[in-house]
């Protein structure tokens, strides 16, 4: 999980002739706001999920009134960043749409009116955790300057935010195959429920057990860099088996335009001509407004006061989808291993581990005996998440530190007398009994019941119990 952050630096007329008319006037003061929509760069987006990675709206900027006769300057901007939280892995390659909206503040009936001033779109590569990337995009006569970055939310780390960090379970080491979590050296990496061994840097998963590779990587665990040297075409996704880039589809293959839109190729991408009632880069936005109550499960509807402007549903924890229609039951995937209890806290999953197991998903079987010493010659025995000591004779307690009274349990049968001895205990048997614990009666004919007494021991002699 993490956050994509967008900082708008300026929005104003681009260089060159044909400067645009100011969007605001003395008669019609207005203010700007921005909408960003993110999609994973290589995904086949369904029409019902227009912004599969997320979307955000900025605050409204300061009110602006055009000075008569002055050219359109850079327009005053809203404060702060646009933040798009993402729940899963950061995909590395993403598509963005940034829309500049004008809110007119005149005396029109029914409150302010919104209209779309400019829309820019692009596709970029970006590693989470990296520095701010700067960009300039032009839309008609307008120019938008902005910076963006993706950062992971703790406990996630890494270029795809797929590695988790957790406090160390032992002071000196992380579990098998897990490294310290730079820069949090006192924490350890922990895997998600992706396929075991999936590269934390170059792989991620959307379904438990799978290992999907970020662009430029291949192999079952995304540990093999894609090599283009032996390939004919540099375009397209990598083939799992060869690690080659194989020819990919053209921009209009499979028609990326939703809702009956028609696609035409442009030199760098494609363009959709949308039917009435739909708009957006892929005709993915319909003329539904917030007045229609499109957000389910308590989702908050933002924007969309008229059919020409988009709405966004901000979903409460536990719901997702463009209309908050999908319940997220992350515990149904049973992510906690080894019988751990799954807790969905809304903002995060937690596993409560059984004794003897650790890790964000209880995936590590603790070495119960590691660093545990049993005193006085005792040996450590692992079991069920707790160590226990098998103590040498004469010692007891959890760590064999206590002197045991071997006679306390009255081990000598049939009235035998017990004596503590450096190597254990000794039973002095009553007449008519023999054995280490005086357990065998002596027969009248002088023969003993099995087992036979060792040679040289007469019935009645004290016998040491070793």
């Amino acid at each position: 999980a993490g956050v994509f952050e967008l900082q708008i630096h300026s929005f104003g007329p681009g260089p060159g002739p044909g400067a645009p008319r100011s969007p605001c006037s003395a008669r019609l003061p207005c203010r700007l706001f921005f909408r960003v929509c993110l999609k994973p760069g290589l995904s086949e987006e369904a029409a019902e999920s227009p912004c599969a990675l997320g979307a955000a709206l900025s605050a409204r900027g300061p009110v602006y009134t055009e000075q008569p006769g002055a050219p359109a300057p850079d327009l005053p901007l809203p404060d702060g960043l646009l933040q798009v939280p993402f729940r899963d892995a950061w995909p590395g390659t993403f598509s963005f749409i940034i829309e500049t909206w004008r809110e007119e503040l005149g005396d029109q009936i029914g409150g302010p009116a919104w209209s779309l001033l400019a829309r820019v779109a692009g596709r970029r590569r970006l590693a989470a955790g990296g520095p701010w990337a700067r960009d300039i995009q032009r839309a008609g006569a307008w120019e938008l300057r902005f910076s963006y970055r993706a950062r992971c939310e703790p406990p996630a780390v890494g270029t795809a935010c797929t590695r988790l960090c957790r406090p160390r379970s032992a002071p000196s080491r992380c579990g098998p195959g897990l490294r310290p979590c730079a820069p949090l050296e006192d924490e350890c990496e922990a895997p998600l429920v992706c396929r075991a061994g999936c590269s934390p840097e170059h792989g991620f998963c959307e379904q438990p057990g799978e290992c999907r590779c970020l662009e430029g990587w291949t192999g079952p665990l995304c540990t093999v860099p894609v090599s283009t040297s032996s390939c004919l075409s540099p375009r397209g996704p990598s083939s799992a088996t060869t690690g080659c880039l194989v020819p990919g589809p053209g921009p209009c293959d499979g028609n990326p335009c939703a809702n009956g839109g028609s696609c035409s190729e442009t030199p760098r991408s494609f363009e959709c001509t949308c039917p009435r009632g739909f708009y957006g880069l892929r005709c993915e936005v319909s003329g539904v407004t917030c007045a229609d109550g499109p957000c389910f499960n308590g989702g908050l509807c933002v924007g969309g006061a008229d059919p020409d402007s988009a709405y966004i549903c901000h979903c409460p924890p536990g719901f997702q989808g463009s209309n908050c229609e999908k319940r997220v039951d992350r515990c149904s995937l049973q992510p906690c291993r080894n019988g751990g209890l799954c807790l969905d806290l809304g903002h995060a999953l937690r596993c409560r581990c059984r004794a003897g197991f650790a890790g964000p998903r209880c995936e590590h079987d603790l070495d119960d005996c590691a660093g545990r010493a049993c005193a006085n010659g005792g040996t450590c025995v692992e079991g069920g998440g707790a160590h226990r000591c098998s103590c040498a004779l004469g010692f007891g307690g959890r760590d064999c530190r206590e002197r045991a009274d071997p006679c306390a349990a009255r081990p000598c049968a049939h009235g035998g007398r017990c004596y503590a001895h450096f190597s254990g205990l000794v039973c002095a048997c009553a007449p008519g009994y023999m054995g280490a614990r005086c357990e065998f009666p002596v027969h009248p004919d002088g023969a003993s019941a099995l087992p036979a007494a060792p040679p040289g021991l007469r019935p009645g002699d004290p016998q040491r119990y070793l």
Epitope: R195, A196, G197, Q207, P208, G209, P220, L221, T223, T241
Partner: antibody, heavy 118, light 107 residues
Framework: QVQLVQSGAEVKKPGASVKVSCKAT????????IEWVRQAPGQGLEWMGE????????VYNEKFKDRVTMTVDTSTSTVYMELSSLRSEDTAVYYC???????????WGQGTLVTVSS | DIQMTQSPSTLSASVGDRVTITCKAS??????VAWYQQKPGKAPKALIY???YRYSGVPSRFSGSGSGTEFTLTISSLQPDDFATYYC?????????FGQGTKLEIK
């Protein structure tokens, strides 16, 4: 305790097909790849392919790509491996194995002997 | 395909001996190597993953090491139960490939 139980031995004629089943118990079936490995008599191990039950995604060894099909029945937690156009050199013990919580084939079925003979 | 070449093919040793089996990959496989033990008529059993990590329940006398193209499996003190065939396997690239096996027999 994780168990993979395979179907019984089969005798097939050259050109026929065989479908071996592997029933999984005591773990979250959909979350772990099932691998198929075969071993000809007196020979080593040869990987045939894998399937992730939760998604149905398969990866096949190029050597078997045109003849092997792996499928899954989630209702019974069973994976199937079908090999067609059998030849005598396909006589082998066929194993299913589970890619476990660590990076290796952690649990194995008992094996299914497939004999191809005219 | 990546070739995994094991040596020796057969190894004779006695109970209590320390034995080492090596496995060479035809190209870099990082640490994506596992080791398995197989007894006649039985399915293989997992021993080592990620080149050097013991699978749960595997006795501590088994250890693995190596990275890149050279890997070793060491049994520090042979027990009667250890006489079997051992296979290395790479899972860095498709198709997964196994070594041809090393048969460990009683001297």
């Amino acid at each position: 305790q994780v168990q993979l139980v395979q179907s019984g031995a089969e005798v097939k004629k050259p050109g026929a097909s065989v479908k071996v089943s592997c029933k999984a118990t005591d773990y979250i079936f959909s979350n772990y790849y099932i691998e198929w490995v075969r071993q000809a008599p007196g020979q080593g191990l040869e990987w045939m392919g894998e399937i992730l039950p939760g998604t149905g995604n398969t990866v096949y060894n190029e050597k078997f790509k045109d003849r092997v099909t792996m499928t899954v029945d989630t209702s019974t937690s069973t994976v199937y491996m079908e090999l067609s156009s059998l030849r005598s050199e396909d006589t082998a013990v066929y194993y299913c194995a589970r890619w476990g919580d660590y990076a290796l084939f952690a649990n194995w079925g008992q094996g299914t002997l497939v004999t191809v003979s005219s | 395909d990546i070739q995994m070449t094991q040596s020796p093919s057969t190894l004779s040793a006695s109970v209590g001996d320390r034995v080492t089996i090596t496995c060479k990959a035809s190209q870099n496989v990082g640490t994506n190597v596992a080791w398995y033990q197989q007894k006649p008529g039985k399915a293989p059993k997992a021993l080592i993953y990620s080149a050097s990590y013991r699978y749960s329940g595997v006795p501590s006398r088994f250890s693995g090491s190596g990275s890149g193209t050279e890997f070793t499996l060491t049994i520090s003190s042979l027990q009667p139960d250890d006489f079997a065939t051992y296979y290395c396997q790479q899972y860095n690239s498709y198709p997964f490939t196994f070594g041809q096996g090393t048969k460990l027999e009683i001297k």
